[in-house]
Structure formats: structure tokens, C-alpha cells
């Protein structure tokens, strides 16, 4: 379900603002963790201090483990390897849209979007374009907001990711 037009009240785990705040924290942590492990450097990304509650920690760990699984997904690796970074914005949104082109949504694909963003960040670090890192995060959150938010609300918020973990494929 793509979408804006969210119809739920404010507050609680399914409010649009809470989903986007949590999404931003999770994306930031995911990118920093992967950049730290793969490139040996942790980019300065802090939008806001992530809440250190047990639920967010659990979600972060869940994302990390799914991300590690995606390292061995050859189809996703091919998709990312084909990315031409000459016009990154257009490419980012094309690849992101392709991930959901059939109109089917699942948590694996949401994490694959974060994974794709982290790979672009690693490329930016390697090519010494650090200012692109914050921009990539912005693109990812914009896509999440415009195309995935209502679906995440329908899953009961980010907590739905925890019950999904164990399904290995992003497809």
C-alpha cells in the first residue's frame, strides 16, 4: 500500500510522526553500524538522539541481522552494483520504486530499502562525498513517508518488523 492520506490519530506507535521519527532513528543506526563495520568509519549523521528504550534496541538488532542476511542476496547485490552514481537522486528513486513495483509490501523489502541506502552511503564514503550521506538518508525517509508509511501503519508500526524476522528473503 503506497501512500499518504494516513487516517490514524496522533500519538502511539502507528501515528505518522512516530513512525517517521522511529524510522529516522533506525535508518541512522543502520547506516552508522554498517559504515563502521564495512568502511571502518562512522559518519556523523545525528538528526536527533535515538531513544535508548528496549524496543528500539530490539528493532536495531533485528535490522542488523536482516542486513547481514542481505549481504548474501545475489539478486539485491546485482541490483545495487548496477547503480550509476552520476545522477544519484534519479537512480535512488528508480531503484527504490523498482523494489515495490509489483505493489506488494513486506518488511524484507523495507529493510532492503535501508540496505540500499547504506550501500550508497558506503560508495559516498569511498568516493569522498560525505555531504551526500545526509542527502541519501533524506531520500530514504522521503520514500518511506510517501510510499511506505500507510503500510507500516497497517502493520501496527515498526514493532511488526520483530514478528517478521525469520523470513529470510527480501522478495
Amino acid at each position: 500500500m503506497d501512500g499518504s492520506g494516513e487516517q490514524l490519530g496522533s500519538g502511539g506507535p502507528t501515528s505518522s510522526e512516530q513512525i517517521m521519527k522511529t524510522g529516522a532513528f533506525l535508518l541512522q543506526g543502520f547506516i552508522q553500524d554498517r559504515a563502521g563495520r564495512m568502511a571502518g568509519e562512522t559518519p556523523e549523521l545525528t538528526l536527533e538522539q535515538p531513544p535508548q528504550d528496549a524496543s528500539t534496541k530490539k528493532l536495531s538488532e533485528c535490522l542488523r541481522r536482516i542486513g547481514d542476511e542481505l549481504d548474501s542476496n545475489m539478486e539485491l547485490q546485482r541490483m545495487i552494483a548496477d547503480v550509476d552514481t552520476d545522477s544519484p537522486r534519479e537512480v535512488f528513486f528508480r531503484v527504490a520504486a523498482d523494489m515495490f513495483a509489483d505493489g506488494n509490501f513486506n518488511w524484507g523489502r523495507v529493510v532492503a530499502l535501508f540496505y540500499f541506502a547504506s550501500k550508497l552511503v558506503l560508495k559516498a564514503l569511498c568516493t569522498k562525498v560525505p555531504e551526500l550521506i545526509r542527502t541519501i538518508m533524506g531520500w530514504t525517509l522521503d520514500f518511506l513517508r510517501e510510499r511506505l508509511l500507510v503500510w507500516i501503519q497497517d502493520q501496527g508500526g515498526w514493532e511488526g518488523l520483530l514478528s517478521y524476522f525469520g523470513t529470510p528473503t527480501w522478495q
Epitope: D2, S4, G5, A97, D102, G103, R145, E146
Partner: antibody
Framework: EVQLVESGGGLVQPGGSLRLSCAAS????????MHWVRQAPGKGLEWVAS????????YYADSVKGRFTISADTSKNTAYLQMNSLRAEDTAVYYC????????WGQGTLVTVSS | DIQMTQSPSSLSASVGDRVTITCRAS??????VAWYQQKPGKAPKLLIY???SLYSGVPSRFSGSRSGTDFTLTISSLQPEDFATYYC?????????FGQGTKVEIK
């Protein structure tokens, strides 16, 4: 209650400029994309420009690219459309709308470009 | 840019009729499609988003569906207040596009 109120329309000569404002209330524009859509007299809806909240990415219709600029001031909870080098074919009612699936619209403001 | 080809451009129907309006996207837009109703002198109103989700407060006689790149708005039983112009719109990302509009008139 969510509300969008446009202002700044009026009569302007070809080549002139106008700045449209879209004051939002009942929600925080920091979390929403904002869009301008216009409708020429007796014609259909034409998307003009969009601004996205997290990357501040902006997009424009080919017909206005290089002449119009969309922006947002989150401290004022207001979106803007700066229109330069106006042409007769820019005459239309201009609406601002919230989100990509445009769930809330303003009442519209009329821009007339004529000598 | 993605084009949205809407048909028919106008139609005449009677109260109680089933009305179908179609939009074809020039390329895949997933289900990032919305439908709007507009009455003269008024701003458009959102009816359907995400191709098939009914917006809050919209009567259930309105429905949307998707088949590939074809999107359909159906009014199951036309009511007097439904005579208006209807537009489809895609927001796949980047440039947004609207269909040309379908005017639903009284037969």
C-alpha cells in the same frame, strides 16, 4: 483541524513576479510533502511543483522549470511558490495540497497574467 | 515523465447507474495512484489513494482497482451529488501527473 490557506494571487503583467503562500494549520509540514497544483480556466488539473520534507528535494513541471521556485519555512509552517517571468499561460487558480496522495487542499488563489 | 491517459473524457449517466472511469499509466507506478472528485469552483477532493484504498469519509459506492498499469474508478450506483469531474493522479516519485479528467454529466 487540518487547513491550508493560499494567498498572494492577483493580477500581474507578463514578465512580472508573484509569491504565493500556503499557510498550514492542524499539522506540522516538517513531516509532509507539499505540492502546488494549478487549473487554468475551463481546463484540467496541472501539477506545478513539489517539495519533500526530509531531503528538501524539489521537483518542477517542465512548463515552469527555471521560472518557479517552491520552498517551505517550517518555523512558519508555510509553503511558498515564487513565480518569476510570468506568462499569459500561467493564468490559473493555484492550489496547495498536502502529501503525494493529496488529502487536503487549500481553497485556491487566482493568478491572472495579462497586460 | 509518466503519462496518465484517462478515458472517457466525458460520459452521460443516470442516477443509479454503475459508472467506470479508467486511467492507463505509460509505465509502472506500482499502486501510487489516487482519484479525485472536483465540482465547479471548488478544490478537488481525495476519493481513493494507493489505487484501491477508500479515503476517510468517502461513501463506499466509490471503489478503485488496479490491473498492471491500468487503474479504474467505479461508482457502483451514481447519486445526484456525484455529477462532477474526476481525475486520476500518479505519484510514483519525482514529477506528479494527472489524467485529463472525466466529466460525469446527467443523461
Amino acid at each position: 483541524e487540518v487547513q491550508l490557506v493560499e494567498s498572494g494571487g492577483g493580477l500581474v503583467q507578463p514578465g512580472g513576479s508573484l509569491r504565493l503562500s500556503c499557510a498550514a494549520s492542524g499539522f506540522n509540514i516538517s513531516y509532509y510533502s507539499m505540492h502546488w497544483v494549478r487549473q487554468a480556466p475551463g481546463k484540467g488539473l496541472e501539477w506545478v511543483a513539489s517539495i519533500y520534507p526530509y531531503s528538501s528535494s524539489t521537483y518542477y513541471a517542465d512548463s515552469v522549470k527555471g521560472r518557479f521556485t517552491i520552498s517551505a519555512d517550517t518555523s512558519k509552517n508555510t509553503a511558498y511558490l515564487q513565480m518569476n517571468s510570468l506568462r499569459a499561460e500561467d493564468t490559473a487558480v493555484y492550489y496547495c495540497a498536502r502529501s503525494s496522495a493529496m488529502d487536503y487542499w487549500g481553497q485556491g488563489t487566482l493568478v491572472t497574467v495579462s497586460s | 515523465d509518466i503519462q496518465m491517459t484517462q478515458s472517457p473524457s466525458s460520459l452521460s449517466a443516470s442516477v443509479g447507474d454503475r459508472v467506470t472511469i479508467t486511467c492507463r499509466a505509460s509505465q509502472s507506478v506500482s499502486s501510487a495512484v489516487a482519484w479525485y472528485q472536483q465540482k465547479p469552483g471548488k478544490a478537488p477532493k481525495l476519493l481513493i489513494y494507493s489505487a484501491s484504498s477508500l479515503y476517510s469519509g468517502v461513501p463506499s459506492r466509490f471503489s478503485g482497482s488496479r490491473s498492471g498499469t491500468d487503474f479504474t474508478l467505479t461508482i457502483s450506483s451514481l447519486q445526484p451529488e456525484d455529477f462532477a469531474t474526476y481525475y486520476c493522479q500518479q505519484w510514483s516519485f519525482g514529477p506528479i501527473t494527472f489524467g485529463q479528467g472525466t466529466k460525469v454529466e446527467i443523461k
